[in-house]
């Protein structure tokens, strides 16, 4: 019986060009976490195997960094990064637990844009 629950950072937003940390936490189970996969819609971004470590997809290696912990850091964000992200926990003996995060990447703030211009 699967008793665990995944807590995530939920719906989050970040500025274009910035970074964001995606975090999930599995609780309420004694199951052994054997691997955590991070996915964006239909693409696998990274794998963190409990024994054999982190592996970032070549398609994302320039903009994705492992950690902290079992989390994932997305860098140099673009508006195209807006969307759903999933943390998939492979566990023994429970099986698979999935958490969902929605990321919205926003254009730089009005205040930031305004600071670039001098008032005559």
């Amino acid at each position: 019986m699967m008793t665990g629950t995944i807590e995530t950072t939920g719906n989050i937003s970040a500025e274009k060009g910035g970074s964001i940390i995606l975090q999930c936490h599995l609780s309420s189970t004694t199951a052994q976490v054997t691997q955590v996969n991070w996915e964006q819609q239909d693409q696998l971004l990274a794998i963190c195997n409990a024994d054999l470590g982190w592996h970032i997809s070549p398609s994302f290696k320039d903009r994705v960094a492992p950690g902290p912990g079992l989390g994932l850091t997305l860098q140099s964000l673009t508006v195209n990064d807006t969307g759903e992200y999933f943390c998939i926990y492979h566990t023994y003996p429970d099986g698979t637990y999935t958490g969902r995060i929605f990321l919205e990447v926003l254009e730089s703030s009005v205040a930031e844009h305004g600071a670039r211009f001098q008032i005559p």
Partner: antibody, heavy 119, light 107 residues
């Protein structure tokens, strides 16, 4: 040059035990997770055990869980596989293997040691 | 566990031919696939990882492709030294499982 050298294989009776060793050299052994992969007489490959870099985490598939124990001695640069309650279906060539750096695949393999379980 | 099926246990080809070795996963493994070559009397050797990334030193006649559940290793111009067993492996979920192997024979 990365080198992995297995030893300890041999003929053992069903129900018996055997301990395999893998001597590692050419890399910082204590920085890498390690694995044992076996190849049965039909040439099928199976990952039978993994261990993290400090020995604090291990994983086994159901086929060997409770019978096999993977361990390591980082001071001796050696990986071990203790096998007990052996069955005829455990007959195989046993390889010690390591992933490549930044490579999702076993880039380094030993030459293997043959385990035969038979009465 | 994810089952990796290599439908062809044997494939026969002539030198210089193009050959494609296929592997089908029992569920979507999202390109977390590697390919190995094992020559007679030797240990397996990594050819391809992440479905299409060629490992260091692997000749460019070896190409990996695929997505979802279907993956292919293509040898563009088979050489005599390519006589070997070829295996796929998935890394998407534990335990990481291998296909049953395809033996490439040269006519």
């Amino acid at each position: 040059e990365v080198k992995l050298q297995e030893s300890g294989g041999g003929l053992v009776q069903p129900g018996g035990s055997l301990k395999l060793s893998c001597a590692a050299s050419g890399f910082t052994f204590s920085s890498y997770g390690m694995s044992w992969v076996r190849q049965n007489p039909d040439k099928r490959l199976e990952l039978v055990a993994t261990i993290n870099s400090n020995g604090g985490s291990t994983y086994y598939p159901d086929s060997v869980k409770g019978r096999f124990t993977i361990s390591r001695d980082n001071a001796k640069n050696t990986l071990y596989l203790q096998m007990s309650s052996l069955k005829s279906e455990d007959t195989a060539m046993y390889y010690c293997a390591r992933l490549g750096t930044g490579t999702l695949g076993f880039a380094y393999w030993g030459q293997g040691t043959l385990v035969t379980v038979s009465s | 566990d994810i089952v990796m099926t290599q439908a062809h246990k044997f494939m026969s080809t002539s030198g210089g031919d193009r050959v494609s070795i296929t592997c089908k996963a029992s569920q979507d493994v999202k390109t977390a696939v590697s390919w190995y070559q094992q020559k007679p009397g030797q240990s397996p050797k990594l050819l391809i990882y992440w479905a299409s990334t060629r490992h260091t030193g692997v000749p460019d006649r070896f190409t990996g492709s695929g997505s979802g559940t279907d993956y292919t290793l293509t040898i563009s111009s088979v050489q005599a030294e390519d006589l070997a067993l070829y295996y796929c492996q998935q890394h998407y979920s534990t335990p990481w499982t291998f296909g049953g192997g395809t033996k490439l024979e040269i006519k």
